[in-house]
Interface confidence: low
């Protein structure tokens, strides 16, 4: 019942041309390229492309033909190469064309850079737009995979194909529309936020195969299919983890198109084996297939079996434990895990981990000892602190949330994480906190079965972010080593780090405190970045400042901003009394 | 994969009609969308009408109200009815079908609009 076993193909590259059609297979080319070359022009990777797809349908017409028969690695490989300008660009990167395939490619894995030195995508009006789509709608889209892919070069390609499809949707409605704007600009909105989550989604993904390895992503992979599909057999959910392993592993290896093929064989099974797997496909299994494959992925979860046994049973109780666990270890621990994740759909994946990981080193422990089963007897009372932990944790950051609103939690929080890991840069420290506060909105809503899940998963997704951003420029021992010993104990790691008492308070710079008439013409949330970029700065220089302190002085601030974007005369106004703000902060911090 | 045949172009006057067929045969359950595009010798290859499994249609401005396109599921047919033809109307136009992107082509069909 293997997917992917496929017959051996003379070409490679024809198989997945003819496999994708020549659309995808020039789009998918288009986001390889640009996810490894980040810097170069998008007329560059056009033509790379071209060039590429002009070759594949030469071995379409004749897979015999000279060159056919390599590698697409070889192939890509070969044609980044060719990029003239790549040393001056992208300086030691260069020296990845001087090896042989395989490290050729792992070496331009290495240089991917999760924030690469880009210009912020600016929004044109709307008109502009329009009109740039109906004249080379193909180049419009082309344009938007390009400026996607090369700032987010993990992300899940097929996916992106999807966003593209959203994407071209949106404009072909709403650029008939009589009001363009309001009908675009909402869409381009929701597209613009799920993109960036989708995006730090499958980073983790990423993370988990390249800093922990398959068992690891393999774990996490049972967790969440076992809760997702807990009417399935463990057989089937181990042939769909196997399956979406390969799949990811392709994707974040940059071998899109393998991947991109291979994720549409696993929907196409999914949905042949509907009955065997998931009672809730049925909807998502009549769409076309990119929408298929990202509804199969979004799918609720299934409702539990009645009357599913004790866990305890075959798990603690029986003599057969520690034969079971020696005889095949991974397979025992990842019935556990299924067993376990299918009756808690309540649970965050990242916990069951923790559960499976104490259960392992339980039998570790015990089935070397003069009577196993009075030693692992217990094992189901160690879970209970391990649990109770992130319900706790959910509870307090809830009621808080609950009380400050949005903006003010995320306040809370960029005090809390600046004041913990001080080294990291101010913007990391931002963009971290703020995504770390969105879980308020996120998740506080749901009923108690329900926010567990949310707000624990969503937090390691954005937990790697900063492990990800910080592992470009090391500043912190405290956060490499969260982020480095064990990935489902980032988050408790991070929980625990208290105030960092070896920081040195920064040196006070009144310009960073200085601010211009140009705020007043910000969005809300640039100029909420602009307060908490302060906020984080104050911070830096009195790590030891209250709550009430930091409260009075960002009231102060507010109240400065609202002044003087009111003043006819607003850069005197932030000038002058700018300089007030700035003396009466030093003041009340005592600086 | 997906064979798409154009046929009906050839030579009319300006302000003259025209009606383009596209017949589509092999894995045809797969298509969702439909669409004629035209490349004039010399230009960009341009979007000239989509239409949706569903029925939903769009045009680019500079054809609206003059063509139109339809599909004949049945006969796994698509159509381009072309009224007010004028000069720069002038180019191949070819049939295109996909799932997601009309990522399959027909060989074209000449539209020559000349007095």
């Known amino acids: 019942r293997g997917v992917f076993r496929r017959d051996a193909h003379k070409s490679e590259v024809a198989h997945r041309f003819k496999d994708l059609g020549e659309e995808n297979f020039k789009a998918l080319v288009l986001i390889a390229f640009a996810q490894y070359l980040q810097q170069c022009p998008f007329e560059d990777h056009v033509k790379l492309v071209n060039e590429v797809t002009e070759f594949a349908k030469t071995c379409v017409a004749d897979e015999s033909a000279e060159n056919c028969d390599k590698s697409l690695h070889t192939l890509f490989g070969d044609k980044l190469c060719t990029v003239a300008t790549l040393r001056e660009t992208y300086g030691e990167m260069a020296d990845c064309c001087a090896k042989q395939e395989p490290e050729r490619n792992e070496c331009f894995l290495q240089h991917k850079d999760d924030n690469p030195n880009l210009p912020r995508l600016v929004r044109p009006e709307v008109d502009v737009m329009c009109t740039a789509f109906h004249d080379n709608e193909e180049t419009f889209l082309k344009k938007y995979l390009y400026e996607i892919a090369r700032r987010h070069p993990y992300f899940y390609a097929p996916e992106l194909l999807f966003f593209a499809k959203r994407y071209k949707a949106a404009f072909t409605e709403c650029c008939q529309a009589a009001d363009k704007a309001a009908c675009l600009l909402p869409k381009l909105d929701e597209l613009r936020d799920e993109g960036k989550a989708s995006s730090a989604k499958q980073r983790l993904k990423c993370a988990s195969l390249q800093k922990f390895g398959e068992r690891a992503f393999k774990a996490w992979a049972v967790a969440r299919l076992s809760q997702r599909f807990p009417k399935a057999e463990f057989a089937e959910v181990s042939k769909l983890v196997t399956d979406l392993t390969k799949v990811h592993t392709e994707c974040c290896h940059g071998d899109l198109l393998e991947c991109a093929d291979d994720r549409a064989d696993l929907a196409k099974y999914i949905c042949e084996n509907q009955d065997s797997i998931s009672s809730k496909l049925k909807e998502c299994c009549e769409k076309p297939l990119l929408e298929k494959s990202h509804c199969i992925a979004e799918v609720e979860n299934d409702e539990m079996p009645a009357d599913l046994p004790s866990l305890a049973a075959d798990f603690v109780e029986s003599k057969d434990v520690c034969k079971n666990y020696a005889e095949a270890k991974d397979v025992f621990l990842g019935m556990f895990l299924y067993e376990y994740a299918r009756r808690h759909p309540d649970y965050s994946v990242v916990l069951l981990l923790r559960l499976a990981k104490t259960y392992e080193t339980t039998l570790e422990k015990c089935c070397a000892a003069a009577d196993p089963h009075e030693c692992y007897a217990k094992v189901f009372d160690e879970f209970k602190p391990l649990v109770e932990e992130p319900q706790n944790l959910i509870k307090q950051n809830c009621e808080l949330f609950e009380q400050l609103g949005e903006y003010k939690f995320q306040n809370a929080l960029l005090v809390r994480y600046t004041k913990k890991v001080p080294q990291v840069s101010t913007p990391t420290l931002v963009e971290v906190s703020r995504n770390l506060g969105k879980v308020g909105s996120k998740c506080c809503k749901h009923p108690e079965a329900k926010r567990m899940p949310c707000a624990e998963d969503y937090l390691s997704v954005v937990l790697n972010q900063l492990c990800v951003l910080h592992e470009k420029t090391p500043v912190s021992d405290r956060v490499t080593k969260c982020c480095t010993e064990s990935l489902v104990n980032r988050r408790p790691c991070f929980s625990a780090l208290e105030v960092d008492e070896t920081y040195v308070p920064k040196e006070f710079n009144a310009e960073t405190f200085t601010f211009h008439a140009d705020i007043c013409t910000l969005s809300e949330k640039e100029r909420q970045i602009k307060k908490q970029t302060a906020l984080v700065e104050l911070v830096k220089h009195k790590p030891k400042a209250t709550k009430e302190q930091l409260k009075a002085v960002m009231d102060d601030f507010a109240a400065f901003v609202e002044k003087c974007c009111k003043a006819d005369d607003k850069e005197t106004c932030f000038a002058e009394e700018g300089k007030k703000l700035v003396a009466a902060s030093q003041a009340a911090l005592g600086l | 994969q997906v064979q798409l045949v154009e046929s009906g172009g050839g030579l009319v006057q300006p302000g003259g009609s025209l009606r383009l067929s596209c017949a589509a045969s092999g894995s045809i359950e797969s298509i969702n969308r439909m669409a004629w595009y035209r490349q004039a010798p010399g230009k960009q290859r341009e979007f000239v009408a989509r239409i949706s499994k569903g029925g939903s249609t769009n045009y680019p401005d500079s054809v609206k109200g003059r063509f139109t396109i339809s599909r004949d599921n049945s006969k796994n047919t698509l159509y381009l009815q072309m009224n007010s033809l004028r000069a720069e109307d002038t180019a191949v136009y070819y049939c295109?079908?996909?799932?997601?992107?009309?990522?399959?082509w027909g060989q074209g069909t000449l539209v020559t609009v000349s007095s």
């Open positions: 295109a079908a996909g799932p997601v992107w009309e990522q399959f």
